[in-house]
C-alpha cells in the first residue's frame, strides 16, 4: 500500500520508498552485517523506512542491497532519485583507510519479477554516488535539511522491468528515500488541440512527435503537432484548431456562446453580442434571429444588424407637362438602417369616372433614368396619354423589402395629363347619300387628348382638288352636308378639336351624289 505524495505532473513514479507502508523488505547481501532496514522518525515523528550501513571498521566491504522488481510501464529512460545521509569519515576516529564516502548504484533489466538472489555480475553500474555534503552528526531536526539528493538516469530500457542495487564499499550511510520515475509530457491542451500523456524518448536529446486532436466543438485549421522533449516539456507547437461556429475559446475549451451572443464561423474570434435588432435564445448560436419586423438580406453578414424596409418617401411633388410628368420626392424618414435604398416607380392609368379602376400603364410609357432601382429621388415619365388620370406610386425599397408584405413604403400622387390636340379620326362613314346631300358619321379619335369641343368637316369637289373647299363644324359625331350638286364626286375630311387645338384630318372619304331622288346608304370611305 502506498501513501500519496505529490510530484511534478511530468513525472510518473514507479517506486517511492517513502510511500510504502510497513517494511520495504528489499534483499540484502550478506543477509546480516550489511545493509539493514531501520525505521527512523521524520520531523513530524512519522516513521521512515531507511536502509543503513556503517561498516567502517573493516576494509574491502561489499554490501549489496537490491530493490524489488520495478515495472518499466513503457518508459525507455528512467530516473533514480536517491536521498541519503552520509557520515563524514572524520567523525569516526580510527577508521581512516577503511571508511569510505561513496557508494555505487547499479541496475539489472529483467522480465522476471521474482528473482530471489543478487547475482552481482548481472548488474550494470550506473554511477558512483558521492555526497555533496557530509557531516559529523545529524539530529532529527536538522536531518531533512542535510539530506543529499542525487538523480541519475538510465536507458534505453527494453525489458518488462528492472532491479536497482546499491553497493556499499565501506561508507556510513542511510538511504532515506529511493524514488524511481520516468518523465512524460503530461496531457495538455495547446491551441485548442489536446495532446495525450506521452512518455519521453529513449535518450536525453530525443523529441517525440505527437499529433494532437481537436478539443470538443473545434476543428483543425492546420494539423496540430507538438514535440515531447526528454525533460517532459512540450516543445514547438505547430498548427491549431479553431472553435466551431457557435463556440468560443474559454479556459482552453470551446464553449458554447452564451445566450445573446453568437459566432458565425470557425475562427479564433470570440462570440460576439447579437447585432442590433436581433437575439439568440439558445447557447451555441451561429447567428442571431431578427426581431419581429426586422430582417437580414441574403448577402448580409451575420454580424450586420437586422434591418427593416424603409418607410415611404416624403414630399412627393409632381409637375405635369402635357403628356410628361416629372416627379420629385425626399428620402424616407426611416431608411430601415440600411444604405442600399432605391426607388421603384409604379404607373397606373385610372378611369376618370372611377379612379379605383386603374390598370398598369403598359410598356408605351418611358421613364428617365429608369423605372426601377432608382438611386436618385426624381424621375421623368414621358409618352403618357394626354388628358388622362394617372396614379404614380414611388416605392422606397432596400435589401430587405422583399421580406415585408406591408405596403407602407410607398407614396402616391394622382395627376391628369394636359389636353392635347386629338389624334386623327380613324373611320368616317357616309350614312345617307341623296342628290343634294350626304349624311356623315364618325368615331371619336382613338386619343381624344382632352375634351372634344367640336369636329370640323372639310369637303370639296374632287375635281377642284382642295383648291376650293367648305368647312362645316359640329359638336356631334355626325352631320348632314346639304346643297351639293347631283352626280358630283366630293371628298370629305373630318378632324376633332380640343382646347389644345385641332387634330389631324382623317383619311379622305370620297362620295358621289345621286342623279335620282332616291337615298343611297353608304358605309365606306369611297361611297359612290
Amino acid at each position: 500500500v502506498t501513501g500519496s505524495r505529490v510530484y511534478p505532473a511530468n513525472e510518473v513514479t514507479l517506486l517511492d520508498s517513502r510511500s510504502v507502508q510497513g517494511e520495504l523488505g528489499w534483499i540484502a547481501s550478506p543477509l546480516e552485517g550489511g545493509w539493514e532496514e531501520v525505521s527512523i522518525m521524520d520531523e513530524k515523528n512519522t516513521p521512515i523506512r531507511t536502509y543503513q550501513v556503517c561498516n567502517v571498521m573493516e576494509p574491502s566491504q561489499n554490501n549489496w542491497l537490491r530493490t524489488d522488481w520495478i515495472t518499466r510501464e513503457g518508459a525507455q529512460r528512467v530516473y533514480i532519485e536517491i536521498k541519503f545521509t552520509l557520515r563524514d569519515c572524520n567523525s569516526l576516529p580510527g577508521v581512516m583507510g577503511t571508511c569510505k564516502e561513496t557508494f555505487n548504484l547499479y541496475y539489472y533489466e529483467s522480465d522476471n519479477d521474482k528473482e530471489r538472489f543478487i547475482r552481482e555480475n548481472q548488474f550494470v553500474k550506473i554511477d558512483t554516488i558521492a555526497a555533496d555534503e557530509s557531516f559529523t552528526q545529524v539530529d532529527i531536526g536538522d536531518r531533512i535539511m542535510k539530506l543529499n539528493t542525487e538523480i541519475r538516469d538510465v536507458g534505453p530500457l527494453s525489458k518488462k522491468g528492472f532491479y536497482l542495487a546499491f553497493q556499499d564499499v565501506g561508507a556510513c550511510i542511510a538511504l532515506v528515500s529511493v524514488r524511481v520515475f520516468y518523465k512524460k509530457c503530461p496531457l495538455t491542451v495547446r491551441n485548442l488541440a489536446q495532446f495525450p500523456d506521452t512518455i519521453t524518448g529513449a535518450d536525453t536529446s530525443s523529441l517525440v512527435e505527437v499529433r494532437g486532436s481537436c478539443v470538443n466543438n473545434s476543428e483543425e485549421k492546420d494539423v496540430p503537432k507538438m514535440y515531447c522533449g526528454a525533460d517532459g516539456e512540450w516543445l514547438v507547437p505547430i498548427g491549431n484548431c479553431l472553435c466551431n461556429a457557435g463556440h468560443e475559446e474559454r479556459s482552453g475549451e470551446c464553449q458554447a456562446c452564451k445566450i445573446g451572443y453568437y459566432k458565425a464561423l470557425s475562427t479564433d474570434a470570440t462570440c460576439a453580442k447579437c447585432p442590433p435588432h436581433s437575439y439568440s435564445v439558445w447557447e451555441g448560436a451561429t447567428s442571431c434571429t431578427c426581431d419581429r419586423g426586422f430582417f437580414r438580406a441574403d448577402n448580409d453578414a451575420a454580424s450586420m444588424p437586422c434591418t427593416r424596409p424603409p418607410s415611404a418617401p416624403l414630399n412627393l411633388i409632381s409637375n405635369v407637362n402635357e403628356t410628361s410628368v416629372n416627379l420629385e420626392w425626399s428620402s424616407p424618414q426611416n431608411t430601415g438602417g440600411r444604405q442600399d435604398i432605391s426607388y421603384n416607380v409604379v404607373c397606373k392609368k385610372c378611369g376618370a369616372g372611377d379612379p379605383s379602376k386603374c390598370r398598369p400603364c403598359g410598356s408605351g410609357v418611358h421613364y428617365t433614368p429608369q423605372q426601377n432601382g432608382l438611386k436618385t429621388t426624381k424621375v421623368s415619365i414621358t409618352d403618357l396619354l394626354a388628358h388622362t388620370n394617372y396614379t404614380f406610386e414611388i416605392w422606397a425599397v432596400n435589401g430587405v423589402s422583399k421580406y415585408n408584405p406591408n405596403p407602407d413604403q410607398s407614396v402616391s400622387v394622382t395627376v391628369t395629363t394636359n389636353q392635347a390636340a386629338p389624334s386623327s379620326i380613324a373611320l368616317v362613314q357616309a350614312k345617307e347619300v341623296t342628290r343634294y346631300s350626304v349624311a356623315l358619321a364618325w368615331l371619336e379619335p382613338d386619343r381624344p387628348n382632352g375634351v372634344i369641343l367640336e369636329y370640323e368637316v372639310k369637303y370639296y369637289e374632287k375635281d377642284q382638288n382642295e383648291r376650293s373647299y367648305r368647312i362645316v363644324r359640329t359638336a356631334a359625331r355626325n352631320t348632314d352636308i346639304k346643297g351639293l350638286n347631283p352626280l358630283t364626286s366630293y371628298v370629305f375630311h373630318v378632324r376633332a378639336r380640343t382646347a389644345a387645338g385641332y387634330g389631324d384630318f382623317s383619311e379622305p372619304l370620297e362620295v358621289t351624289t345621286n342623279t335620282v331622288p332616291s337615298r343611297i346608304i353608304g358605309d365606306g370611305a369611297n361611297s359612290t
Partner: antibody, heavy 121, light 106 residues
Framework: QVQLLQSGAEVKKPGASVKVPCKAS????????MSWVRQAPGQGLEWMGW????????TYAQGSTGRFVFSLDTSVSTAYLQISSLKAEDTAVYYC??????????????WGQGTLVTVSS | EIVLTQSPATLSVSPGERATLSCRAS??????PAWYQQKPGQAPRLLIY???TRATGIPDRFSASGSGTDFTLTISRVEPEDFAVYYC????????FGQGTKVEIK
C-alpha cells in the same frame, strides 16, 4: 547469537595491574569497534574509550590517564582492558560493549556481563 | 567536554502511567543522545540510538525526541519490567553519560 563474555571478578592491591578480557562471539569481531565503560559502586556509567578492532587503533576518553590500555587478540576475537598502577578509586565494574556506528549517531548495542575489579589493600 | 544532566534523579510512577525523562546538554549538540536501561546487577541495555531509532527488541512504548540541548525519553505506558535506571549518552569525539534517572514504582 551475539555475545560478549568477560572474566570473573578480580581483587587487586593498589599499584598492581589487571588485564580484563572480553571475548566476542556470534559476529565478525573485526567488523565492530569495542568500547569500555566502567561503573563505580552505586554510581553512574563512565565511558573510557574504544578500540578499532580492525586496526587496533584506540581512542581514549578525554582526561584519561596513561594507566588504561586497550588491546586486541583478533585470533581469539578478544579485546583487553589493562589497568596499571591500580588505585582504590579504580574499584568498579568494567564493561566491554560492542559499538554500533550509524550515520545518525552511535550506541553500544551488545554488552558484556561486566567484570568487578576491586582494589583494596 | 559536554556535560549531560538528567532529571529528575528519581521518578515515581505507577504501572500504566506515562513517564517522561529529561536529558539536558551543557551546550547544543547536533545529535540526539542514545538511551540505556540498567536494572540492578545487570549490564546496561541499549534502548534508543541515532535518529531516535529503537534498538532490536525494544518495544514501541519507548520513544525519544528533542534537539539542541533538551532531550526526552518517554515511556508511554510504564510496565512492571520498566522500573530501572535510565542513562542518556552523548557521542562525538568524546562520549559522556548523564548521571541517570531512577524510575521506581509509586
Amino acid at each position: 547469537q551475539v555475545q560478549l563474555l568477560q572474566s570473573g571478578a578480580e581483587v587487586k592491591k593498589p599499584g598492581a595491574s589487571v588485564k580484563v578480557p572480553c571475548k566476542a562471539s556470534g559476529y565478525t569481531f573485526t567488523s565492530r569497534a569495542m568500547s569500555w565503560v566502567r561503573q563505580a559502586p552505586g554510581q553512574g556509567l563512565e565511558w573510557m574509550g574504544w578500540i578499532n578492532t580492525n586496526t587496533g587503533n584506540p581512542t581514549y576518553a578525554q582526561g584519561s590517564t596513561g594507566r588504561f590500555v586497550f588491546s586486541l587478540d583478533t585470533s581469539v576475537s578478544t579485546a583487553y582492558l589493562q589497568i596499571s598502577s591500580l588505585k582504590a578509586e579504580d574499584t568498579a565494574v568494567y564493561y566491554c560493549a560492542r559499538v554500533r556506528f550509524t550515520v545518525y549517531g552511535d550506541g553500544m548495542d551488545v554488552w558484556g556481563q561486566g567484570t568487578l575489579v576491586t582494589v583494596s589493600s | 567536554e559536554i556535560v549531560l544532566t538528567q532529571s529528575p534523579a528519581t521518578l515515581s510512577v505507577s504501572p500504566g502511567e506515562r513517564a517522561t525523562l529529561s536529558c539536558r546538554a551543557s551546550q547544543s549538540v547536533s545529535s540526539n543522545p542514545a538511551w540505556y536501561q540498567q536494572k540492578p546487577g545487570q549490564a546496561p541495555r541499549l534502548l534508543i540510538y541515532g535518529a531516535s531509532t529503537r534498538a532490536t527488541g525494544i518495544p514501541d512504548r519507548f520513544s525519544a525526541s528533542g534537539s539542541g540541548t533538551d532531550f526526552t525519553l518517554t515511556i508511554s505506558r510504564v510496565e512492571p519490567e520498566d522500573f530501572a535506571v535510565y542513562y542518556c549518552q552523548q557521542y562525538g569525539p568524546s562520549w559522556t553519560f548523564g548521571q541517570g534517572t531512577k524510575v521506581e514504582i509509586k
